[in-house]
Interface confidence: low
């Protein structure tokens, strides 16, 4: 007797109900009086649920299991497990006996999403460049154990001086605490990403630290060390500041913003007056804040072509300048998934799955995964084409040989925004019979 169960583990969220599928092929004339069905824990052989002598013998597993009585006669011996707990994780064996005897084991993988991380900083005031700070990232009540990644404002991994601990509570759910020790630069953004490896769920948080600057004798022009990230179509502020001396007046100020590479004039303030935008009429200063030393530039309706370095020149009696980078970004759309061929699929067939996501910037990173979050790297072709606005359309094609059934997920990542757009498709091939039919 052939007993069929899913090849892949069944993933269930803590607190939800799970169905452990199990089926057999009843012969003509089969009646439930002939059926003996036993579900038990594979390792300990503990009885979970049984059906014998034509009757459901009920749950032997904390009263949280049920069969599908109306479907048993059709060969559906599946088990419903209610209010799933971490302790339920493991292998369950489905034994079916009519005249012949057969059994198969199905794995239950339990999962719980992690909470959005909370971030704390120690010390959290009077910070100066060069100080060592401890940033703690805490995320709660997830399962299984998380993977924790730290990144800077550009999404570059921070691997040094990280200590991560994970503690399980009485329900078996994990609380994660990850500590990053870092020496401060002029300023910086630090992001913590807590990943659930089973759900492929990422929980992000970040903290931006702007230390105080040490005073110096000369005019010091200050800009952010890290690029300013701006979404296409939004407004961006390129921050620039100087320290006005007592008695400073705007009549003394010469302020010039220009493109660092080409030296093209962007905006200027001279002779006590705003000389206006020389950059497609999309720039403005903050006139009410200039006297306090705020020379920041507002760039409106950001385009991809704006990306690059802008230099802020300030001249009073002294002269100073500094360059700030503008990094333009646009989020990718939720991927659309297409399948070719898309019907009459059988295990062993080769299918082509196309994942398309539109109008993002900069170029995306594309990852394919199966239903358990295992990366699929073979036979993937990805193309990215920029449109007239410089935004990219991404098309990624995965060629795969079908198993009994399967879920295929495409993840399109914007490396600057650290934004992930997901799409997935579940393919259920018609079941094979063994031996194969002629």
């Amino acid at each position: 007797l052939e007993v069929q169960v899913p090849e892949d583990p069944v993933v269930a969220l803590v607190g939800t109900d799970a169905t452990l599928c199990c089926s057999f092929s009843p012969e003509p004339g089969f009646s439930l009086a002939q059926l003996n069905l036993i579900w038990q824990l594979t390792d300990t052989k503990q009885l979970v649920h049984s059906f014998a002598e034509g009757q459901d013998q009920g749950s032997a597993y904390a009263n949280r299991t049920a069969l599908f009585p109306d479907l048993l006669a059709q060969g559906n011996a599946s088990l419903r497990l209610q209010r799933v707990r971490v302790a339920d994780e493991g292998s369950f064996t489905c034994f079916v006996s009519i005249r012949d005897f057969g059994s198969a084991a199905v794995s239950l993988q339990v999962a719980a999403p992690y909470s959005k991380p909370s971030m704390t900083l120690e010390p959290n005031k009077d910070l100066r460049p060069g100080d060592t700070v401890t940033i703690t990232c805490s995320s709660y009540q997830g399962y299984p154990e998380a993977e924790v990644f730290w990144q800077d404002g550009q999404g570059v991994p921070l691997t040094g001086n990280v200590t991560t601990s994970q503690m399980a509570n009485e329900q078996g759910l994990f609380d994660v605490h990850s500590i990053l020790r870092v020496v401060l630069g002029a300023n910086g953004t630090y992001s913590c990403l807590v990943r659930n490896p089973v759900l492929q769920q990422d929980a992000h948080s970040s903290v931006t630290i702007t230390p105080q600057r040490s005073p110096t004798g000369a005019v010091e022009v200050q800009v952010p060390e890290d690029p300013v990230v701006a979404l296409v179509g939004t407004d961006a502020t390129l921050r620039c500041s100087f320290s006005p001396e007592p008695g400073f007046s705007l009549a003394q100020l010469n302020l010039i913003w220009q493109l660092t590479d080409t030296k093209q004039l962007v905006h200027s303030f001279t002779e006590g007056r705003d000389q206006g935008s020389a950059y497609a009429n999309r720039t403005a200063l903050f006139p009410d804040l200039l006297a306090q030393g705020n020379a920041s530039l507002r760039l409106q309706r950001v385009r991809v072509a704006d990306e690059g370095s802008f230099t802020c020149f300030v001249s009073i009696r002294d002269f100073g300048s500094a360059a700030v980078s503008l990094q333009v970004a646009a989020p990718y759309s939720k991927p659309s998934m297409t399948l070719e061929p898309n019907k009459d699929l059988r295990p062993g067939d080769t299918v082509t799955i196309t994942c398309s996501s539109y109008r993002g910037y900069p170029e995306a990173e594309v990852f394919w995964q199966d239903g358990q979050g295992v990366p699929l790297t073979g036979n993937v072709t990805t193309s990215q084409m920029a449109n007239e606005q410089g935004l990219f359309d991404v098309h990624s094609v995965l060629r795969v040989v079908l198993g009994a059934n399967g879920t295929y997920s495409c993840l399109v990542r914007n490396p600057v925004l650290q934004q992930d757009a997901h799409g997935s498709v579940t393919i259920t091939g018609q079941p094979m019979t063994f031996p194969p039919e002629a």
């Epitope: 550009q154 999404g155 570059v156 691997t159 040094g160 990280v162 060390e225 980078s325 170029e363 490396p415």
Partner: antibody, heavy 114, light 110 residues
Framework: EVQLLESGGGLVQPGGSLRLSCAAS????????MSWVRQAPGKGLEWVAG???????YYADSVKGRFTISRDNSKNTLYLQMNSLRAEDTATYYC????????WGQGTTVTVSS | QSVLTQPPSASGTPGQRVTISCSGS????????VHWYQQLPGTAPKLLIY???RRPSGVPDRFSGSKSGTSASLAISGLQSEDEANYYC???????????FGGGTKLTVL
């Protein structure tokens, strides 16, 4: 396809200077940390210098004060300016993406000899 | 003399499992993630294992990495003749503020 292509190597006398270039393609260059690594003939790998995407720089003690790493994001190019060259700087120089070099170039050879 | 210590050579027969060690200190392996590189004769090195135990796409699952305390290991199971190469470990060093490579291990398949 992600590619890195080094150039600028050659024969130079002790005390001389040389500038290596590394042209990047197939990825968003400005978003990535970059590095230079060298390998003397018959020897192991030695990390030389690295530059963050925000242009902060790091150097091995053996080249500090003599070598300068820089980048031009508009040209998708990484540079290594090498001054006061010594015989022990003779090596194949590789550029790579990230400090941990997930992608390598094919290398360019620098020979310091009189 | 490298701060990260590797055995200069290792060997094994086809099908065997071979382990290459990399020993450091609390300033490097103790607090940072480890990367491994393979350099076949006459070619540029390639990243084999990153972030201590992750494989880039295209690297067979015969290669695995691990770390314990101030030491790291690269394991190769089901050894094949094409695995004959030099293997290097590397990590960041907090005291030197630079990236370090080990001295390298020449693996011979007998």
């Amino acid at each position: 396809e992600v590619q890195l292509l080094e150039s600028g190597g050659g024969l130079v006398q002790p005390g001389g200077s040389l500038r290596l270039s590394c042209a990047a393609s197939g990825f968003s260059f400005s978003n990535y940390d970059m590095s230079w690594v060298r390998q003397a003939p018959g020897k192991g790998l030695e990390w030389v210098a690295g530059i963050r995407s925000g242009s902060r720089t790091y150097y091995a003690d053996s080249v500090k004060g003599r070598f300068t790493i820089s980048r031009d994001n508009s040209k998708n190019t990484l540079y290594l300016q090498m001054n006061s060259l010594r015989a022990e700087d003779t090596a194949t120089y590789y550029c790579g993406r990230y400090f941990n070099m997930d992608v390598w170039g094919q290398g360019t050879t620098v020979t310091v000899s009189s | 003399q490298s701060v990260l210590t590797q055995p200069p050579s290792a060997s094994g027969t086809p099908g065997q499992r071979v382990t290459i060690s990399c020993s450091g200190s609390t300033f490097n392996i103790g607090t940072n993630l480890v990367h491994w590189y393979q350099q076949l004769p006459g070619t540029a090195p390639k990243l084999l294992i990153y972030l201590t135990d992750r494989r880039p796409s295209g690297v067979p699952d015969r290669f695995s990495g691990s770390k314990s305390g101030t030491s790291a290991s690269l394991a190769i199971s089901g050894l094949q003749s094409e695995d004959e190469a030099n293997y290097y470990c590397a990590t960041w060093d907090d005291s030197l503020n630079s990236f370090l490579f080990g001295g390298g291990t020449k693996l011979t398949v007998l």
